[in-house]
Every structure is written in structure tokens, then in C-alpha cells.
Interface confidence: low
């Protein structure tokens, strides 16, 4: 009876997400059969988040809109480990928008989800950011320094990375 009601709850939760994500990939968390964490198919998962690499080229704002339609945001990178995971799925000859911008051009960088910007956990390429008119951040590959961040003009179309919390059912 308990298992039945749990299954009914799961199904209704899945229906909720179906309008955005017709297919979810779920894994059992730990040893408890009750706890499943899911990411939309074909998103990738790391710790408590799901990630999607959007290969369509759009401006920063349009990229953020594209993520938000899917219930996500442009990616907020909180740790070196998270960045190391993300770059495994990126192409070296491409650039990808992050959820980091400086709307006023005053070097007040801010993350889209209001996570405080911590100068100690940033991965700018050396010499970056370097232009007050370049108010959006990308991650790209430079042969000398591998993967890092760069500031660019927000209207220049780029690929992007979306991030959302895992769905727990």
C-alpha cells in the first residue's frame, strides 16, 4: 500500500515534467529504493545538477531564454570539479556562454541565479576579463592555458551550457 501510493506520487511528478522533458533518465540514489534522481534525456548529470550543451548559436540573452524554457539557467560554475566535468562534453574549437554577466559594464559580475560572485572561484584566462564593453562570459579553449573564461560582447552568437537541479522522484 505504501509502495503503491509512492508510485502514484512518482507518476504525477513525472507528468508534471513531461511538458518540458518527454524523457527522463533516472538513477537510484544510494541504497534506498525510494530515492531516484533524474535528468532529462539526453542531459548529463554531475552531483545534484543536470547539464545540457546547446549547440545552436544565439546571443547571451536568447541563450538564457532557451535554458529557462527548459526549466534551467545558463550554467553557474561553483567549483573546479564542476568545471572539469563540464569541459569533458565541450568541443575545443567552440565557445559556450556561461550564466555570468556584467550588465552595467562596471566589472560587477553576477551569476544568473544570484549566486554571489566569488573572485576566488573564477577561471578566467590570463588577461581576462579585459574589456568593459564585453559584458558576458564564455568558456573556451586556449592551447596555452586549456579551458578558461573570457568576456565577450553579449550579442555575438555562441553555443551555451544550461544547468538545472536534478529532479527527485
Amino acid at each position: 500500500n505504501f509502495m503503491y501510493s509512492k508510485t502514484v506520487k512518482r507518476l504525477s511528478k513525472l507528468r508534471e515534467y513531461q511538458q518540458y522533458h518527454p524523457s527522463l533518465t533516472c538513477v537510484m540514489e544510494g541504497k534506498d529504493i525510494e530515492d531516484w534522481s533524474c535528468c532529462p534525456t539526453p542531459w548529463t548529470s554531475f552531483q545534484s545538477s543536470c547539464y545540457f550543451i546547446s549547440t545552436g548559436m544565439q546571443s547571451w540573452t536568447k541563450s538564457q531564454k532557451n535554458c529557462s524554457v527548459m526549466g534551467a539557467d545558463l550554467v553557474v560554475i561553483n567549483t573546479r570539479e564542476e568545471q572539469d566535468f563540464i569541459i569533458q562534453n565541450l568541443k575545443r574549437n567552440s565557445s559556450y556562454f556561461l550564466g555570468l554577466s556584467d550588465p552595467g559594464g562596471r566589472r560587477h559580475w553576477q551569476w544568473v541565479d544570484q549566486t554571489p560572485y566569488n573572485e576566488n572561484v573564477t577561471f578566467w584566462h590570463s588577461g581576462e576579463p579585459n574589456n568593459l564593453d564585453e559584458r558576458c562570459a564564455i568558456i573556451n579553449f586556449r592551447s596555452s592555458e586549456e579551458w578558461g573564461w573570457n568576456d565577450i560582447h553579449c550579442h555575438v552568437p555562441q553555443k551555451s551550457i544550461c544547468k538545472m537541479k536534478k529532479i527527485y522522484i
Epitope: T61, S101, V112, H155
Partner: nanobody
Framework: QVQLQESGGGTVQPGESLRLSCEVS????????MAWFRQATGKDREFVAA????????VYGDSVKGRFTMTRDHPKKMVYLQMDNLKPEDTAVYYC??????????????????WGQGTQVTVSS
């Protein structure tokens, strides 16, 4: 259908003030980022000011910083642009614009989904 209607334009002398209003007819007003742009005859459209959905954040174009103030009134679904110490170079048609993604407010006119018809502001002695 979202509609934006500007008002409050007119002719003033240098150093005087004007207040532009933009009425937004949509139930989703509180989720829109809003902006003002202007276009002088023969020139490109220029970013003036923008405000985030909550009204907590505002951004101003370099040429109006310290003189113009943008605010919004959620219950009235209105956006305002208070323009003080006006200069002849402020003469232009002023447009109100709305962006569906209220969390972002860049001064890029390509990003705004809705536009008003504009109101003329002339600063002349």
C-alpha cells in the same frame, strides 16, 4: 498580446525636465525586464536605460548617467523615465521595450520582444 504605449514627450528648453511614461498591457508585466531606447533622425537606435523585472537593478547608457532615472510601478503596470537637465543632444524619438526574460537586462535592442510606437522629445532653445 502585449502592448506598450509611451506618453509624456514634448518640447522643452535645455536644462529642463520631462517624465516619460510607458503603459504595458499584459498580465505578465511583473516578469518583464523593461528598457528605454531612443533614435535621433538619421542615427542608430541608442540604449538609454533598462530595469530588471523586480525593479531592483537598473542600467543606464553612458550619455544619460546621472541625469535620467528609470523606475517601474507594478500595480499600475507602468514604466517611467525621469529626464532631468535635458540637452539638445537628447532630442529623439523615445521607445519603450519589454523583454520576456526579466532576469536579463542588456542594452541590446535585438533582445527585446515587445516595442511601443515611440514618443518624440525635442530639446531646443
Amino acid at each position: 498580446q502585449v502592448q506598450l504605449q509611451e506618453s509624456g514627450g514634448g518640447t522643452v528648453q535645455p536644462g529642463e525636465s520631462l517624465r516619460l511614461s510607458c503603459e504595458v498591457s499584459t498580465d505578465t508585466f511583473s516578469s518583464l525586464a523593461m528598457a528605454w531606447f531612443r533614435q535621433a533622425t538619421g542615427k542608430d537606435r541608442e540604449f538609454v536605460a533598462a530595469i530588471s523585472w523586480s525593479g531592483a537593478s537598473t542600467v543606464y547608457g553612458d550619455s544619460v548617467k546621472g541625469r535620467f532615472t528609470m523606475t517601474r510601478d507594478h500595480p499600475k503596470k507602468m514604466v517611467y523615465l525621469q529626464m532631468d537637465n535635458l540637452k539638445p543632444e537628447d532630442t529623439a524619438v523615445y521607445y519603450c521595450a519589454g523583454d520576456l526574460d526579466g532576469r536579463t537586462w542588456h542594452g541590446d535592442d535585438l533582445e527585446y520582444d515587445y516595442w511601443g510606437q515611440g514618443t518624440q522629445v525635442t530639446v531646443s532653445s
